[in-house]
């Protein structure tokens, strides 16, 4: 079995986790994708998923999680805005391809959210006090709730993650800078 590795990201409360998950374009463009949390001793739990079939460049918002699937670039963008300490945990991005088991798209992410510097609320440039500017989709997405950890297979490429402020612009002009390794053949 492939060893599941982790990447650690330490962020402050109020900041945004921005992850771009690479996938094989031809095979998985329209496949439903999901963002899951993995708690000790439990099955992975799906927190948000794209539609069926997954739509191109169409934001799906579930609470503070925003998913956008860019078919042209073969990547799923996952953002968790206004991070809270309780968001700390282990996450993964998966592709559903029923009736096969889901595939994990990259190394799992160990997210550690810590309290921001003390001071006036909202003074930190990375805090999220305003309403996030991505309009939520009204389309309902049918998300499978759990994935069996024994059957999730890992793909080789790593994700790229960075910290952004709530007003950060969606900019895919530099997507070629992302390391692109074929995920599945």
């Amino acid at each position: 079995a492939t060893k599941l590795t982790e990447e650690k990201y330490e962020l402050k409360e109020g900041q945004t986790l921005d992850v771009k998950c690479d996938y094989t374009l031809e095979k998985f463009a329209s496949s439903q994708k999901a963002w899951q949390i993995i708690r000790d001793g439990e099955m992975p739990k799906t927190l948000a998923c794209t539609e069926r079939p997954s739509k191109n460049s169409h934001p799906v918002q579930v609470g503070r999680i925003i998913l956008e699937d860019y078919h042209d670039h073969g990547l799923l963008r996952v953002r968790m805005v206004n991070l809270q300490v309780e968001d700390s945990g282990l996450y993964q991005c998966v592709i559903y391809q029923p009736p096969k088991e889901p595939h994990m798209l990259f190394d799992r992410i160990r997210l550690v959210v810590t309290k921001g510097f003390s001071g006036t609320p909202g003074s930190n440039e990375n805090s999220t006090q305003n309403v996030y500017k991505i309009p939520p989709t009204t389309t309902k997405a049918l998300c499978p709730l759990y994935t069996s950890p024994r059957t999730v297979t890992q793909a080789p490429p790593k994700s790229t993650a960075d910290v952004s402020t709530p007003d950060s612009e969606i900019n895919l002009t530099n997507v070629t800078d992302i390391i692109r390794v074929p995920v599945f053949n």
């Epitope: 496949s31 069926r52 559903y96 391809q97 009736p99």
Partner: antibody, heavy 120, light 107 residues
Framework: EVQLVQSGAEVKKPGESLKISCKGS????????IGWVRQMPGKGLEWMGI????????RYSPSFQGQVTISADKSISTAYLQWSSLKASDTAMYYC?????????????WGQGTMVTVSS | EIVLTQSPATLSLSPGERATLSCRAS??????LAWYQQKPGQAPRLLIY???NRATGIPARFSGSGSGTDFTLTISSLEPEDFAVYYC?????????FGGGTKVEIK
Amino acid sequence: EVQLVQSGAEVKKPGESLKISCKGSGYSFTTYWIGWVRQMPGKGLEWMGIIYPGDSDTRYSPSFQGQVTISADKSISTAYLQWSSLKASDTAMYYCARGSPWDGRLFDIWGQGTMVTVSS
Amino acid sequence: EIVLTQSPATLSLSPGERATLSCRASQSVSSYLAWYQQKPGQAPRLLIYDASNRATGIPARFSGSGSGTDFTLTISSLEPEDFAVYYCQQFDNLPYTFGGGTKVEIK
């Protein structure tokens, strides 16, 4: 154009073997599931099984497990349904169908069907 | 295996009328239910998936609803080309069984 083309009608005797085919074109054959569905004369649809040509992963309905064999040759983009010993009750129209690109359990493209007649 | 029961077996209606077809599952299939249309001498065609989503190219007069064990396919105003047999299919659990079909015929 995405299409599935099935082999022609067959007339066989009980106890004979048979292999019918379904050739896919216009898409990446190895990355889509192919299913087989039986329709007996004047009856409804029966789900027989599916195969993923990329790795030959196959799932059967218990009703057809051991009665038929589903296979695929990805080098020629063709899926097969075969019997080692036909019965009169195998007389039916057999359809192959492609699983959708985002959910292989749904059949979005269908072949024209192959009529199999088994009679002594 | 999951048994799907369709009713009525035959529906006799006139063009322009509303058709309501039912599909009941022997156990919950969540929203993993599809509807197919089959015309005489033709292969089936996917109409609805996930209980309520229209497949590509399917006219808006076709709509699906339901979840769990009870599902409905509605054709809001029958066109001449809609007279056919309609099958539901569950794809929640293997084997992905079909219902027995409902024939929509011209009255």
